[in-house]
Amino acid sequence: YSHWPSCCPSKGYPSEELLRWSTVPVPPLKPASLDFHSVSCRASEDGPLNSRAISPWRYELDRDLNRLPQDLYHARCLCPHCVSLQTGSHMDPRGNSELLYHNQTVFYRRPCHGKKGNHKGYCLERRLYRVSLACVCVRPRVMG
Amino acid sequence: YSHWPSCCPSKGYPSEELLRWSTVPVPPLKPASLDFHSVSCRASEDGPLNSRAISPWRYELDRDLNRLPQDLYHARCLCPHCVSLQTGSHMDPRGNSELLYHNQTVFYRRPCHGKKGNHKGYCLERRLYRVSLACVCVRPRVMG
């Protein structure tokens, strides 16, 4: 793996204008399937993926202005089990609705300090941040 | 949304060593459920989430050394339909296995140019990059 600079002194070239996070317009990071109104344990026959899933979920906003991305969304399962494929409206206990987790790369804004301890701008600190991406219908584990 | 610097001149404080991408040790970004050997259309009763799912999937590596994260993983569905919760092996045509997409924030390393056009280091260019996170079992859309 190659490494390359991640720390950004507050002075010097390029200008503050160019130093903005994005060099292209970026809409708020909002999942296409975001639906805060879907709170029932049922699989819809239309709408976004998270409401049509037989392991339906909603999204919960996680905002941190000192992090990039500033907005992350955590999936929250609406049912403990999977919803029946036959009807989409009653649970089938043969399947569990489980969260799928992912360690996402994020960047935190941290002050940089010079050799004499003086403030020299902001560093980008790379971290792994655990987010829940979706709920997945799985067969329960068989305990051996 | 607040904005803060994302461009990193190649000279000046802090040192190249401190300018490495991560200020903490970071393991390779590899999903916990990564399993390149699971290529059959069946839902296991053990193993990682992507193999126990009734919409099982495998991961495909997408590496770009000029991007952060350098390694991304794309989900690839192993079945067109969902797998039966009853048997874990037969497909159930009442459900479709669909990819869940997400526009992930990534950063590309781009040369920064000075006022006179000379190379002044590397800028971090923020982009949205579409990745497939998982395969989800959904009820088919009902056409109105």
């Epitope: 494929l85 036959q86 009807t87 409206s89 089938d92 206990p93 | 039966s84 159930d92 045509p93």
Partner: antibody
Framework: QVQLQESGPGLVKPSETLSLTCTVS????????WSWIRQPPGKGLEWIGY???????NYNPSLKSRVTISVDTSKNQFSLKLSSVTAADTAVYYC???????????????WGQGTLVTVSS | DIVMTQSPDSLAVFLGERATINCRSS????????????LAWYQQKPGQPPKLLIY???SRESGVPDRFSGSGSGTDFTLTINSLQAEDVAVYYC?????????FGGGTKVEIK
């Protein structure tokens, strides 16, 4: 043996709400799924929807925006409300028990005798 | 929605003869995981509610005479009445319970010739 009996007005005005009740005897309403089905005069059968005692419902998409099925476990009854009715909703309305096995709905058995509802001004 | 199509619309058969009613679904109602066809047949006599005859495409409901039999798989199904009796005059409906919305065929009227 399980018996079902529909009751409610036989005449409803256009744009009003049709309301019917099904009284179940010989079985606890809490143990099964229950359904409404209708049959316009001289025509075929159309499934309206079902309910479980917990309130879990499923409606035919063609009627979904107008239908509400509810349950009253204390009276061993379940009910149908169909709003904004027109002449096309004139039909014999049946209630029926839905057989359930292996976590899936199956066939309808038994059925009530049915009640004719006419939509007319 | 799964569309159920019955044929013929009506059928006249001599007493003691065989009556055959067909039902076709717009998509398969067979599920491989349990090897079952999600199809039922009902009989409806004038002024009465439908009565279950056959479920799982070929299983006869208890109390139903053995002259009634169901067959077929996937999308094509048949209800056969061997040795038609006078009391069999009725309209017969097929119904799929593979997926909601649950749907019925248009019905086949069986009469005595």
């Amino acid at each position: 043996q399980v018996q079902l009996q529909e009751s409610g007005p036989g005449l409803v005005k256009p744009s009003e709400t049709l309301s019917l009740t099904c009284t179940v005897s010989g079985a606890s309403i809490s143990n099964y799924y229950w359904s409404w089905i209708r049959q316009p005069p001289g025509k075929g059968l159309e499934w309206i929807g079902y309910i479980f005692y917990s309130g879990n419902t499923n409606y035919n998409p063609s009627l979904k925006s107008r239908v509400t099925i509810s349950v009253d476990t204390s009276k061993n009854q379940f009910s149908l409300k169909l709003s904004s009715v027109t002449a096309a909703d004139t039909a014999v309305y049946y209630c029926a028990r839905v057989r359930f096995s292996d976590y899936e709905l199956n066939w309808f058995d038994p059925w009530g005798q049915g009640t004719l509802v006419t939509v007319s001004s | 929605d799964i569309v159920m199509t019955q044929s013929p619309d009506s059928l006249a058969v001599f007493l003691g003869e065989r009556a055959t009613i067909n039902c076709r679904s717009s998509q398969s109602v067979f599920l491989g995981s349990n090897n079952k066809n999600y199809l039922a047949w009902y009989q409806q006599k004038p002024g009465q509610p439908p009565k279950l005859l056959i479920y799982w495409a070929s299983s006869r409901e208890s109390g139903v005479p053995d002259r009634f039999s169901g067959s077929g798989s996937g999308t094509d199904f048949t209800l056969t009445i061997n040795s038609l009796q006078a009391e069999d005059v009725a309209v017969y409906y097929c119904q799929q319970y593979f997926i909601t919305p649950l749907t019925f065929g248009g019905g086949t009227k069986v009469e005595i010739k």
